[in-house]
Interface confidence: low
């Protein structure tokens, strides 16, 4: 193999490599190939050279296309008509000269933070793009529409964000931002301009036309007109606050909608109770002002008595069940129908049946000998107390059972 590989004239992207001819095995050397690697673990790769094709009588060539401020080792491989020889031993390790960065940082983005802040993020540049010592980032930013760029120097290759804090920064304001890197040899090229928003603040506007209505003894529906997206941030949803008439608003419970719904159902309320309700918009920064309050009264509770006097009849493939209607008291809500849960002895889970009458017929397999039935009222106040009975197939006759 060739020997005596020596590096001379080290530049930022080029070096001059010299070597001595090795034994040609009685066949003239036709050409040389130069390879480089970045120690300690880099793989040997062929490099561009000047001249591009190195003839067999050459003992020096220039290596092109190297990265500034990078460690390299080089080796030489000779070829003749018989084939390619063993590579030379590696040259001593050298470091190319420094140069100003040649690539702009990427991943420019940002947003968030506290009121009055503009946060800008980017992807830190790896060692191969730093090109020299004293590396850092130079950030330029201006409010969209402004002509004056402000700049900030952020030292350190690992830096990945910058926070500009100023009381004059209005909430959720778009800023044009660009970035370049620098080292002690100079500044690199600028990135493309990105649009980054300053930190959000709470919404300024309250929802309007808030309307609330009790829909059961423990629930109410709340609807409202949405707020327009204001300049303070991205609207995330609405917060409903509700409290009993006679209580202080400070004692209010609250529920937030996930998304920009304009209605919500609030549950866990007391029956036959008047509530005050307000709605507020919220974003990442917090909650906005309250709407005017609306009122809603929950329904009277469902009857506290289960259906009684339950009887049934089996046919070959169906089961008919009837019961006495439940008549609500004055302080109870109306009965609009009945819910029946049916569970046979083949399954762990019941099926739900609804009827507006005081009887129901359901299909059952012929091999069902007995089943559990649960019947309860349903109505505007919600579901009532269930009656549970164990029924047995008994030659198609009717039977009465106690609850």
């Amino acid at each position: 193999p060739p020997g005596g590989v020596v590096v001379r004239d080290i530049g930022d992207t080029t070096i001059q490599l010299s070597w001595s001819r090795g034994f040609d095995n009685h066949s003239p050397i036709a050409k040389y190939t130069l390879q480089a690697r970045t120690p300690p673990a880099g793989k040997w790769k062929q490099v561009r050279t000047n001249p591009a094709n190195i003839e067999g009588n050459a003992e020096t060539a220039q290596v092109l296309g190297l990265t500034p401020w990078m460690d390299y080792e080089f080796r030489v491989i000779a070829s003749n008509i018989l084939g390619t020889g063993e590579p030379s031993g590696p040259s001593s390790k050298i470091r190319t000269r420094e140069a100003a960065p040649s690539v702009a940082p990427s991943g420019l983005s940002g947003g968030g933070g506290a009121p009055g802040e503009l946060i800008v993020n980017w992807t830190p540049m790896s060692r191969e793009y730093q090109n020299g010592d004293g590396f850092g980032y130079l950030l330029s930013f201006r409010r969209q529409g402004s002509t004056h760029w402000q700049t900030a120097r952020v030292p350190g290759a690992d830096a990945q964000y910058f926070v500009y804090s100023n009381e004059s920064v209005r909430p959720y304001t778009p800023f044009e931002v660009k970035i370049r890197s620098y080292n002690r040899r100079g500044d690199g090229p600028e990135s493309l301009t990105a649009l980054v928003y300053s930190a959000e603040e709470e919404p300024r506007v309250a929802p309007t036309k808030v309307w609330a209505k009790g829909v059961s003894s423990s629930e109410m529906n709340v609807t409202w007109e949405p707020v327009q997206q204001d300049m303070n941030g991205i609207l995330l949803g609405y917060e409903i606050r509700y409290w009993k008439a006679g209580d202080k608003e400070a004692a209010a419970d609250r529920v937030r909608t996930a998304g920009l719904d304009t209605s919500a159902r609030v549950s866990g309320l007391h029956p036959n109770t008047k509530y005050h309700v307000t709605v507020r918009a919220y974003n990442r920064a917090g909650t906005g002002p309250a709407s005017p309050s609306a009122n809603a009264t929950t329904m009277k509770p469902p009857p506290r008595r289960p259906p009684g006097n339950i009887s049934w009849t089996f046919s070959s493939s169906s089961l008919s069940i009837k019961w006495d209607p439940v008549v609500p008291f004055r302080n109870e809500s109306a009965v609009t129908g009945y819910k029946m849960l049916y569970q046979n002895d083949l399954h762990l889970t019941p099926t739900l049946h609804l009827t507006g009458k005081n009887w129901i017929e359901i299909p059952v397999p012929e091999d069902i000998g007995h089943a559990l039935v649960q019947i309860r009222t349903t109505g505007p106040g919600g579901d009532g107390i269930p009656a549970e009975v164990h029924i047995v197939r008994n030659g198609g006759t009717s039977m009465m059972v106690e609850n």
């Epitope: 609807t223 996930a258 998304g259 719904d261 304009t262 209605s263 889970t349 019941p350 739900l352």
Partner: antibody, heavy 117, light 108 residues
């Protein structure tokens, strides 16, 4: 008997727009919430959007939020899905469904939307 | 969003055998708002179970659902030839509504 028939599918390029319709019959349309669900070729089901009976509230999957709009015309017993800024990943069979106790109780047979350049 | 994970991915059984399909939620499913659907090739899905345990209209009683919170099960007590299909669970308790990735029940 509940009957749902989707229409409006077709082949279009990325960035294009399309409006799907779902004609409903056999039930009191205005009393029921409706939904759109899609299924990419050979893939699972993905809920797209939902709308309450009176049309007052709408809901969207994150993947379509801001691009798709669900609406309904209760006088025509028809559900719509307006799809804008379509992408290749929106290619799917789109089903409309009637909600029963919150679940997707009745489904149409679907309409194929293909987004390809 | 709530992520639903179904297991197993594929279930190889013979007609007459019992099939047990599992659906696990990444967080509690509100009010047991969980449904099961059956889908056969080239067809729209069909609702089997809603409210975690209530069979939909016209669904044979060999299909049953159980569970609450984060763990739900669909059981097919005796597989009929027409039951071999893909089964999906779906939660509708919180937006966005989400589906599991599906369990394929195939003939062994």
């Amino acid at each position: 008997q509940v009957h749902l028939v989707e229409s409006g599918g077709g082949l279009l390029q990325p960035g294009g727009s399309l409006r799907l319709s779902c004609a409903a019959s056999g039930f009191t349309f205005s009393s029921y919430a409706m939904s759109w669900v899609r299924q990419a070729p050979g893939k699972g089901l993905e809920w797209v959007s939902g709308i309450v009976g009176n049309g007052g509230s709408t809901y969207y999957a994150d993947s379509v939020k801001g691009r798709f709009t669900i609406s309904r015309d209760n006088s025509k017993n028809t559900l719509y899905l307006q799809m804008n800024s379509l992408r290749a990943e929106d290619t799917a069979v789109y089903y409309c469904a009637k909600l029963e106790w919150g679940a997707l109780g009745y489904w149409g047979q679907g309409t194929l939307v293909t987004v390809s350049s | 969003e709530i992520v639903l994970t179904q297991s197993p991915g594929t279930l190889s059984l013979s007609p007459g055998e019992r099939a047990t399909l599992s659906c696990r939620a990444s967080q509690s499913v509100s009010s047991s708002y969980l449904a099961w659907y059956q889908q056969k090739p080239g067809q729209a899905p069909r609702l089997l179970i809603y409210g975690a345990s209530s069979r939909a209209t016209g669904i044979p009683d060999r299909f049953s659902g159980s569970g609450s919170g984060t763990d739900f099960t669909l059981t097919i007590s005796r597989l009929e030839p027409e039951d071999f299909a893909v089964y999906y669970c779906q939660q509708y308790g919180s937006s966005p509504w989400t589906f599991g990735q599906g369990t394929k029940v195939e003939i062994k």
